[in-house]
Interface confidence: low
């Protein structure tokens, strides 16, 4: 556990007066309908709120929307609906906010049936002004910004055309017809699939994958017989139909589709699916669905090329294609992921990995909790976390697990303590060490958020009754103060704080209901006066991440290195501040077998760190597809884990002999590719 100070709860001095002076109410002159909120830029304080209200008439639905803008983190709002000519905005497209701090916003308007094309409102000054633009097409999807250049936009039309703008939506050009899916890659590259015969659905498995690197001037066909494609980290994936049957396999490219290799993953049938759970520049977590309607599959982790995969976790809960999985990247500590497995008895259990999928274990039982009715042994059980699946099942779980990269080690989640996830009302648990140890933080379900990089945690009870109380903690959830933010309770709908957890402002959204009318209302509370002073060096303490045995020389080593962090002391009530940067010191570890994954044709027997040959491949030359050629692999069975930085110690050697035979099984070999220009 991260360093905690004394367990006694001291009250934050005069907090009621301090918070009362910093609580700002805004009542929206609106009927209730729906509300959506977007932050424009980072640390700008600009929020856009779109309220929409549908009035069902006999023959049609009449819609009305209003747009509000705040530039002080939600303390005050101004009605700017007139800037968009009082137009009804389509909420299904949301507000398309530009990347980074570009200040760009695109709103898509509802237009009448007979119009030639859609209409958008564009702003490039953080929504101070908008320009109306009529489109030469009806958009099917939200405008997508190029990550590299916010002036470049792409959109699909209802006619399946791929449209591109190079001047932030001022002018549009259709660069290709018959397009099913389009995505921005790196360097302003666009990848998209096209159909030749009937439609996207009819041609599934016979689509072509195309690439343009110059916004539609020229194209290259980089794949055929495509079912779907995806981008993750530096990897481009395509699922490709097999020649002889209805199965498909994953192929992977790390050079934008110029060359492809077949991923060493099981093929899947018509009813199955692949899903990229997480990807970075080092590796990929891939879920492969089991045959039949089982609701589970297997997680595999890739090598650094995305080609060789190790089985990471069996019976991984993932209901259907596009369905629910609890897979969660714990962003507050490197290498940590949490997910759920479906056990043989159909109960759901939570598993955690601290080493990027190398090993999975149950979550340690919180010290201050009893095992519930699901536990066979009342003294031995574990914590089980509620995530997307529980929410989809309408359990009393208002929020998924929460972690933030700049609130090091902190994870907050709803959970139950037993042998499996319980359908009983959950409590909220917190870990301050990235998931190694847990403590019950709050009784019953709550909404929660992290402010000031972990300096403050805010929570609101999940209740069907109106509420007027907010809870906050300045010591990572050990002690809680309650603050009544209004005399008149509201029906609570959500907590909003600026993404990135650096802000000290929280907005409580809800509505008031009277006999005749209901109105949207927000309360924005600024905690700056609770954290009166800036944190000094004395407020921080050294913390070794992943530490489980301080006496062990290799303590804290994960993926070949350990990291010491400066962590805010729980007893320190001070501001990390908006420009707080996580301070960490890495040190390299010696290599052990744990730093290597098993190469193609090898596997790790349970509870063993050695890689042994797969019996069915023993004595055979190992041949596999790499860049459209068959490779002959001579190996002692080990390959370094992607992202592992260990040095010295154990060093298994590997070599690859290239037979340069063409792969018959690779449908994406370079010979099959062609280019064309517009």
């Amino acid at each position: 556990s991260a360093p905690g100070e004394d367990e006694e709860c001291g009250r934050v001095r005069d907090f009621v007066a301090k918070l009362a002076n910093n609580t700002h109410q805004h009542v929206f002159d609106d009927l209730r309908g729906s509300v959506s909120l977007s932050w424009v830029g980072d640390s700008t304080g600009v929020i856009l709120v779109l309220t929409t209200f549908h009035v069902p008439l006999v023959i049609m639905t009449f819609g009305q929307s209003k747009l509000y803008r705040s530039e002080d983190y939600g303390k005050n709002f101004k009605d700017i609906t007139d800037l968009i000519n009082n137009t009804f905005i389509r909420t299904e497209f949301g507000m398309a906010i530009g990347p980074e701090n570009s200040g760009k916003v695109v709103l898509t308007a509802e237009v009448s049936g007979g119009s030639r094309g859609g209409r958008i409102f564009r702003s490039s000054d953080f929504a101070k002004n908008f320009v109306q633009t009529d489109l030469p097409f009806h958009p099917l999807t939200q405008m997508m910004y190029s990550p590299q250049n916010s002036d470049y936009l792409l959109a699909l039309s209802t006619e399946n055309g791929l449209w591109v703008s190079k001047n932030f939506g001022g002018k549009w050009e259709e660069i290709h017809k018959a397009v099913c899916l389009a995505k921005w890659g790196s360097d302003n590259t666009i990848f998209f699939t096209t159909y030749a015969n009937g439609s996207c659905k009819a041609d599934l498995g016979a689509l072509e994958l195309w690439r343009t690197s110059d916004l539609g001037k020229s194209f290259k066909t980089i794949g055929v017989k495509i079912y779907s494609f995806g981008l993750g980290g530096r990897f481009l994936f395509a699922s490709v139909m097999a020649d002889k049957d209805t199965t498909r396999r994953i192929h992977v490219s790390t050079d934008q589709g110029d060359t492809w290799s077949m991923a060493q993953l099981p093929s899947v049938g018509q009813e199955q699916f692949y899903s990229i759970l997480a990807a970075n520049d080092d590796m990929v977590f891939m879920h492969v669905d089991e045959p039949g309607d089982t609701g589970f599959g297997t997680i595999f982790t890739s090598d650094d090329r995305g080609i060789v995969y190790s089985k990471s976790l069996d019976r991984h809960l993932y209901t259907t294609t596009g369905g629910e999985t609890d897979f969660t990247n714990v962003t507050s500590l490197r290498g940590v992921y949490i997910t759920s497995v479906l056990s043989e008895d159909n109960s759901i259990q939570t598993m955690i990995t601290f080493d990027q999928g190398g090993r999975w274990t149950h979550l340690r039982k919180p010290e201050n909790s009893e095992c519930d009715a699901t536990a066979k042994n009342k003294n031995e059980c574990s914590l089980h976390i509620h995530a997307s699946y529980s929410i989809s099942q309408k359990l009393n779980v208002p929020m998924a697990p929460l972690s933030e990269p700049n609130a090091v080690g902190i994870v907050i989640a709803h959970g139950s303590v037993g042998d499996a996830i319980s359908v009983m009302v959950p409590d909220v648990y917190i870990s301050d060490d990235g998931g190694y140890s847990w403590t019950k933080m709050l009784e019953g379900p709550h909404y929660y958020t992290i402010l000031d990089s972990g300096g403050i945690i805010v929570a609101i009870e999940h209740s069907s009754r109106p509420i007027n109380v907010i809870k906050f903690s300045t010591d990572e959830g050990q002690c809680w103060q309650t603050y009544t933010f209004t005399r008149d309770p509201i029906y609570f709908t959500g907590l909003a704080s600026e993404p990135g957890a650096r802000s000290m402002n929280i907005s409580i959204w809800g509505f008031t209901e009277s006999f005749l009318t209901s109105q949207w209302v927000s309360y924005t509370i600024d905690f700056k006066d609770i954290l009166e002073r800036n944190c000094e060096e004395k407020d921080y303490t050294i913390w070794l991440a992943h530490s489980t045995d301080p006496e062990d020389y290799e303590d804290g080593c994960i993926l070949g290195y350990k990291e010491q962090f400066l962590r805010l002391r729980k007893s320190s009530v001070c501001q990390n501040g908006r420009d707080y940067v996580v301070t960490k010191q890495p040190s390299i570890c010696l290599c052990s077998l744990e730093d290597f994954l098993c190469d193609f044709g090898y596997y790790r027997p349970e509870n063993d760190s050695k890689c042994v040959e797969q019996p069915e491949l023993k004595g055979h030359d190992l041949e596999f597809c790499l860049y459209g050629r068959e490779e002959h692999l001579t190996t002692n069975g080990y390959r370094k884990i992607p992202g592992d930085k260990c040095q010295g110690g154990v060093n298994p050697v590997r070599e690859v002999k290239d037979l340069k035979k063409k792969c018959t099984s690779n449908f994406l070999s370079p010979e099959k590719q062609n280019s064309k220009s517009n």
């Epitope: 060096e537 050294i542 301080p550 303590d555 400066l566 301070t583 040190s587």
Partner: antibody, heavy 129, light 107 residues
Framework: QVQLVQSGAEVKKPGASVKVSCKAS????????MSWVRQAPGQGLEWMGI????????SYAQKFQGRVTMTRDTSTSTVYMELSSLRSEDTAVYYC??????????????????????WGQGTTVTVSS | EIVMTQSPATLSVSPGERATLSCRAS??????LAWYQQKPGQAPRLLIY???TRATGIPARFSGSGSGTEFTLTISSLQSEDFAVYYC?????????FGGGTKVEIK
């Protein structure tokens, strides 16, 4: 209680090496950096360098670079300081001192210093021919 | 490296009187400064850290002040056990450096 116990006095000839040990007890050894400080007869204190017990990374004062080696053994919670190519001016009392803020060496932007809060009893090293 | 200069080299004070010791850094060390007391034949003992915070068990008559380049250690009423050599030390930038020391002797 927290204490640092150092090895006994040494007499060495010029050109030789000396290795002084410092055994920590009463606290988690890997949580704190350890500095070495020496004091020549009738002189002031001189900082020689620091070691991080986690990982064993070191930082030495320029004056001792190439002659001093600091190591640690986490299994015995012991830190070692070895000084080679001894000369008569190395005659001094050598102290190990727990240094909670050694991390400031890695992060020069540190704004606070906790001081060397626990000291060993000192080891006298005499260099004479 | 940062050079620490202490003054005076020797301070003669009668028991019960106030003693003021100075320490100057050649460049700013913020508040990354500690004061130590050393008696003959003993290891140094930490008195003040962070320029002004008393270490555990140190009597209230010892106080530290200053930041940046100028620092002061004050002993409000000297006791017989306070006669010793006092060193300041910076830890703003490596290498850590000590001042030459101030000897407080009985007048």
């Amino acid at each position: 209680q927290v204490q640092l116990v150092q090895s006994g006095a040494e007499v060495k000839k010029p050109g030789a090496s000396v290795k002084v040990s410092c055994k920590a007890s009463g606290y988690t050894f890997t949580k704190y950096y350890m500095s070495w400080v020496r004091q020549a007869p009738g002189q002031g204190l001189e900082w020689m360098g620091i070691i991080n017990p986690i990982g064993g990374s070191t930082s030495y004062a320029q004056k001792f670079q190439g002659r001093v080696t600091m190591t640690r053994d986490t299994s015995t919670s012991t830190v070692y300081m070895e000084l080679s190519s001894l000369r008569s001016e190395d005659t001094a009392v050598y102290y190990c001192a727990r240094d909670p803020s050694g991390i400031a060496l890695a992060f020069p932007a540190s704004r606070y210093y906790y001081g060397m809060d626990v000291w060993g009893q000192g080891t006298t090293v005499t260099v004479s021919s | 490296e940062i050079v620490m200069t202490q003054s005076p080299a020797t301070l003669s004070v009668s028991p019960g009187e106030r003693a003021t010791l100075s320490c100057r850094a050649s460049q700013s060390v913020s508040s990354n400064l500690a004061w130590y007391q050393q008696k003959p034949g003993q290891a140094p003992r930490l008195l003040i850290y962070g320029a002004s915070t008393r270490a555990t068990g140190i009597p209230a008559r010892f106080s530290g002040s200053g930041s940046g380049t100028e620092f002061t250690l004050t002993i409000s009423s000297l006791q017989s056990e306070d006669f010793a050599v006092y060193y300041c030390q910076q830890a703003r930038l490596g290498p850590w450096t000590f001042g030459g020391g101030t000897k407080v002797e009985i007048k």
